[in-house]
Interface confidence: low
């Protein structure tokens, strides 16, 4: 789990001074002047460091009070329509940080597994109430990773309007049910997204050029389930020019055979397909229409799987997925506990990476590092991981460029600006930029070779398979080649 990994920072940089307002204009509907920040990182080519230096020097020279920090906080807004609620009937909501000069809106769907029966929802309510109720939500949240307004932490979209939508529906953002006699809980994930979009139109979203619906884990799957519906909603409300795109992080799951089969008792060990099958009925779950029409009644669970729903989507979607995703391994009962693993488990894990890689073959915009981890885009050091020399923010920038205004990923990738980035090396952490691993018990950092040997990886056997000297293989592992 989480205790095993930390993120490596590639050299701490000082926080940037706040950017000065560049021009003033009237905010729609208010007559009040608003600050506008026309600098836009996604349009920057070439040397990012040099550009950053220019921005900083410009900011410091124009902004005498540079000790003041930009307020990083997103502020809580509970939905005005209080009939759209969390599991326990408390109003759902969103956290917002506006950026008046920007026509980009990032809506992030939080993750956090799910529950699919009265019993395991009761248990979830006892232990993880924040994921089922808004009663104890803080008034503010700090934007991190792709939700950060600091250019160093978020070179991709630091200037966007940031929206964090807390997950409190436990339904993978699919539910459209209301309180009834037989249901203690309500499941309104899909309705929450719809209502948040509706309310944001009155807070400036109406002027957006691009809406990026992003999410991690269950939120990543939520993106796949809802992105087309959001586009449709905006078209119906008379905003067809807003370009809706998706960014699904760690939500691309496989219906592969479990490493060890278990009965469907609790959320974590129940095979995902069975959990979702039960969940859809319990939640009154909705899946995208075009996907649903491809499966017969009762088989809608297929549309929760990225590789099955993706080909039916109209909106462009960028898929981010660790090849060795911890949630997938947990659901497959193959997670690495810190104990040495048997050969069968190694083969299973390697095969998982291979299968996942295959499902991403026809996904033009994808970023899949060969790491054992879960979630990335709202981690502060999300910029550190690279695939084939390209970081995720850079890949997203290239994706923006490839889309231009056409809403379709172009067939020929832009020169020097790749968007299909899937690691080809075959085992966990064969990519040297993976999040650093720590021994679960000692807290000691491990390099790739140490980690693999600690997990029972047989250097001798693998070297033989690859036709290499064991020492050469160890060298390759340590350097990540």
């Amino acid at each position: 789990g989480e205790g095993r990994k930390t993120w490596r920072r590639r050299g701490q940089q000082p926080a940037p001074a706040p950017l000065p307002p560049q021009r003033t204009e009237a905010a729609p509907g208010t007559g009040q002047p608003v600050e506008s920040f026309p600098l836009d990182f996604t349009a920057v080519e070439g040397n990012m460091d040099s550009f950053m230096a220019q921005v900083k020097s410009l900011a410091q020279s124009l902004y005498p009070c540079s000790a003041q920090q930009l307020n990083e906080d997103l502020r809580l807004h509970l939905l005005l329509n209080t009939s759209v609620t969390c599991n326990d009937g408390s109003p759902a909501g969103y956290y917002l940080k506006e950026s008046k000069g920007s026509r980009r809106w990032l809506l992030f769907l939080e993750g956090g597994w799910y529950c699919f029966s009265r019993e395991n929802c009761d248990s979830r309510y006892d232990t993880m109430r924040r994921l089922m109720s808004s009663k104890d939500w803080p008034q503010t949240r700090t934007g991190t990773g792709i939700l950060s307004s600091q250019p160093e932490e978020n070179p991709y979209w630091w200037n966007a309007n940031m929206v964090f939508i807390p997950y409190c529906s436990s339904d993978v953002w699919s539910g459209a049910s209301s309180k009834s006699e037989k249901n203690e809980y309500v499941f309104m994930g899909a309705l929450i997204i719809r209502e948040v979009v509706q309310e944001l139109l009155g807070r400036g979203l109406s002027g957006a050029k691009v809406l990026l619906l992003a999410g991690s884990s269950a939120g990543g799957t939520g993106v796949l389930l809802n992105v087309d519906r959001v586009a449709e909603q905006l078209e119906q409300l008379g905003y067809p020019a807003i370009q809706v795109r998706g960014l699904a992080d760690s939500g691309w799951f496989l219906d592969n055979k479990q490493y060890r089969r278990t009965d469907c008792v609790d959320t974590v060990t129940c095979a995902p397909t069975e959990a979702i099958r039960r969940g859809i009925r319990y939640w009154n779950g909705m899946v995208p229409e075009r996907c649903r029409s491809q499966f017969k009644e009762g088989e809608e669970w297929n549309c929760f799987l990225g590789y099955k729903v993706y080909p039916t989507l109209r909106c462009p979607v960028f898929v981010v997925q660790w090849l060795f995703d911890e949630a997938q391994l947990t659901a497959d009962n193959a997670h690495l506990t810190g104990q040495p693993v048997q050969e069968g488990q190694w083969l299973y894990i390697q095969n998982l990476g291979h299968e996942l890689r295959n499902t991403l073959k026809d996904v033009p915009a994808s970023f899949a590092p060969a790491c054992l981890s879960h979630e990335i885009i709202i981690r502060s050091h999300w910029t550190d991981v690279q695939v084939k020399g390209t970081s995720l923010p850079r890949a997203l920038h290239c994706w923006d460029r490839s889309l231009h205004d056409s809403h379709k990923a172009s067939k020929t990738p832009l020169k020097g600006c790749p968007i299909h980035l899937v690691d080809s090396c075959p085992w966990p952490h064969c990519n040297p930029s993976c999040p650093t691993i720590r021994d679960q018990f000692t807290g000691q950092e491990m390099n790739v070779a140490q980690f693999l040997m600690h997990m029972g990886f047989d250097v001798q056997t693998v070297a033989q398979q690859q036709g290499l000297e064991p020492s050469k293989l160890l060298g390759m592992l340590s350097s990540g080649s």
């Epitope: 729609p28 509907g29 007559g31 005005l80 026509r103 509706q198 309310e199 139109l201 009155g202 807070r203 400036g204 109406s206 002027g207 957006a208 050029k209 078209e235 119906q236 409300l237 008379g238 905003y239 067809p240 020019a241 370009q243 231009h404 205004d405 056409s406 809403h407």
Partner: antibody, heavy 119, light 111 residues
Framework: EVQLVESGGGLVKPGGSLKLSCAAS????????MHWFRQAPEKGLEWVAY????????YYADTVKGRFTISRDNAKNTLSLQMTSLRSEDTAMYYC????????????WGTGTTVTVSS | DIVLTQSPASLAVSLGQRATISCRAS??????????MHWYQQKPGQPPKLLIY???NLESGVPARFSGSGSGTDFTLNIHPVEEEDAATYYC?????????FGSGTKLEIK
């Protein structure tokens, strides 16, 4: 200077066809949704068609659906309206207009081109 | 479609006085603090010109004697003090949904 200039109007017989063009200059054309409107002599303004900035979405008024086609070429900064099966009630001054991206109002209008459908 | 009813159809106002034009929508065109109603001026032989957007915001370059107000379904355009050059037809337009529709127009004459 931000400008829209229509062309292609003229006299045409009922059932005939005509293609109107609108040349944009002075702004980033590809950033904006564009609309066609018309105004019959001594009458009010009527919306005809809409095309989104990247041509992904098009909408038509019921009165022209199936007969008119809106298109755009962002590389050439031009908007077009192909009109077929013209009727006498299509006689009007045709305007292209730029939809402001915030709020759906029209902040730039062309000077108009006249279409007369008569036998 | 949303129907916009403008009144009066025409009015004559003395130079320097106030002109008030009303526009009523067949359904609410405001949501979450924004009112999707706009006002245009059109002179003979010319295209419409945007005056007021989102109910009350003055378009750049438009004289401050023009002002807009209202929310929900009822909106008003005021011109004060009226000047000679304000003789024109005025239209309201909503953008709450597609299709955008216009009022039938109010013709302003200067006495």
């Amino acid at each position: 200077e931000v400008q829209l200039v229509e062309s292609g109007g003229g006299l045409v017989k009922p059932g005939g066809s005509l293609k109107l063009s609108c040349a944009a200059s002075g702004f980033t054309f590809s950033d904006y949704g564009m609309h066609w409107f018309r105004q019959a002599p001594e009458k009010g303004l009527e919306w005809v068609a809409y095309i989104s900035s990247g041509s992904r979405t098009v909408y038509y008024a019921d009165t022209v659906k199936g007969r008119f086609t809106i298109s755009r070429d962002n590389a050439k900064n031009t908007l077009s309206l192909q009109m077929t099966s013209l009727r006498s009630e299509d006689t009007a001054m045709y305007y292209c207009a730029r939809k402001h991206y915030n709020g759906g109002y029209f902040d730039v209008w062309g000077t108009g081109t006249t279409v007369t459908v008569s036998s | 479609d949303i129907v916009l009813t403008q009144s009066p159809a025409s009015l004559a106002v003395s130079l320097g006085q106030r002109a008030t034009i009303s526009c009523r929508a067949s359904k609410i065109v405001s949501t979450s603090g924004y009112s999707y109603m706009h006002w245009y001026q059109q002179k003979p032989g010319q295209p419409p010109k945007l005056l007021i957007y989102l109910a009350s915001n003055l378009e750049s370059g438009v004289p401050a004697r023009f002002s807009g107000s209202g929310s929900g379904t009822d909106f008003t355009l005021n011109i004060h003090p009226v000047e000679e050059e304000d003789a024109a037809t005025y239209y309201c337009q909503h953008s709450r949904e597609l299709p955008p529709t216009f009022g039938s127009g109010t013709k302003l004459e200067i006495k």
